[in-house]
């Protein structure tokens, strides 16, 4: 299972990188368009990947003013990059019972990023627990 565990490690690295990017964007909330965006919270079990894709699809935008425009837009671009898939991710893609993106409460960029970080932390935690218990599901 070497290649499988390498894939899992790549996935973990990517999720941690996403947290770093979210943290970086939080420094620039005043340079983001103050639009309200769907921000999943208290995501039900097995709908994490669905919620994750809602965060990725959200139209987070730079206000395009000042010297931070490029840094912000590169970070937003990084956020939208697909992470390495996992068994759980592949399975969850076929779940039709998860809420649609539009059904989630909309929040301004600051809260949107906080909730995104919270989901990423939850996914990492689940991933670590599943590995501890010998499963490769997530």
């Amino acid at each position: 299972h070497k290649s499988s565990s390498q894939g899992q490690d790549r996935h973990m690295i990517r999720m941690r990188q996403l947290i770093d990017i979210v943290d970086q964007l939080k420094n620039y909330v005043n340079d983001l368009v103050p639009e309200f965006l769907p921000a999943p919270e208290d995501v039900e079990t097995n709908c994490e990947w669905s919620a994750f894709s809602c965060f990725q699809k959200a139209q987070l935008k730079s206000a395009n003013t000042g010297n931070n425009e490029r840094i912000i837009n590169v970070s937003i671009k990084k956020l939208k990059r697909k992470p390495p898939s996992t068994n759980a991710g592949r399975r969850q893609k076929h779940r039709l019972t998860c809420p649609s993106c539009d059904s989630y409460e909309k929040k301004p960029p600051k809260e949107f990023l906080e909730r995104f970080k919270s989901l990423l932390q939850k996914m990492i935690h689940q991933h670590l627990s599943s590995r501890t218990h010998g499963s490769e599901d997530s």
């Epitope: 420094n27 425009e69 490029r70 837009n73 671009k77 990084k78």
Partner: antibody, heavy 119, light 111 residues
């Protein structure tokens, strides 16, 4: 494997026009930020223009020295990026590279096409 | 515009020794713990090749003898031990804001 191939360079008189093309392959072109960078013995490496992805609504950015004279554009269906150069000056001479800006830094470069502006 | 000043303009280093190239920015290219400075290697007749991104991260496939450091306005590229294939011109470039600018280059020759 990523490949960027420039074409369209050559000799042009001052005040003339020229259009450079860059054909891309080996990556998801529509997601890419594409740039033109030029190089001359006098000015070294010089960023010229950038066009961002469809997701960003294809905004364009230019170096002050070419603003109003050069136009960067792209055709995602052809995985190509272009540089229309008008009112050319001697100082625009050099090798023009098509590059992909991949998150941090210019990771992929073409081999370049030589533009010579001379009477 | 952020001006990048490289030094020295050229240097000659013996095989196996250390080469150190500096790049100074006219204003800080670092913010919130990230330094938006990158290093490239260019050999005659070839386009530049990315070596180091974000000041200290080694680009995939680049030998570990290349390393980058620095923050704010002062950055350094180190090559140790220098090998024959390292003879080239090295450029720094920032991406803190537009316009993106490059240093004038440092030509590395082998003694």
């Amino acid at each position: 494997e990523v490949e960027l191939v420039e074409s369209g360079g050559g000799l042009v008189q001052p005040g003339g026009s020229m259009k450079l093309s860059c054909a891309a392959s080996g990556f998801t072109f529509s997601d890419a930020w594409m740039d033109w960078v030029r190089q001359s013995p006098e000015k070294g490496l010089e960023w010229v223009a950038e066009i961002r992805s469809e997701a960003d609504n294809h905004p364009t950015y230019y170096a002050e020295s070419v603003k109003g004279r050069f136009t960067i554009s792209r055709d995602d269906s052809k995985s190509s990026v272009y540089l229309q150069m008008n009112s050319l000056r001697a100082e625009d001479s050099g090798i023009y590279y098509c590059t992909e800006y991949d998150y941090e830094g210019f990771v992929h470069w073409g081999q370049g096409t030589l533009v010579t502006v001379s009477a | 515009d952020i001006v990048l000043t490289q030094s020295p303009a050229s240097l000659a280093v013996s095989l196996g020794q250390r080469a150190t190239i500096s790049c100074r920015a006219s204003k800080s290219v670092s913010t919130y713990g990230y330094s938006y400075m990158h290093w490239y290697q260019q050999k005659p007749g070839q386009p530049p090749k990315l070596l180091i991104y974000l000041a200290s991260n080694l680009e995939s496939g680049v030998p570990a003898r290349f390393s980058g450091s620095g923050s704010g306005t002062d950055f350094t590229l180190n090559i140790h031990p220098v090998e024959e294939e390292d003879a080239a011109t090295y450029y720094c470039q920032h991406s803190r804001e537009l316009p993106l600018t490059f240093g004038a280059g440092t030509k590395l020759e082998l003694k």
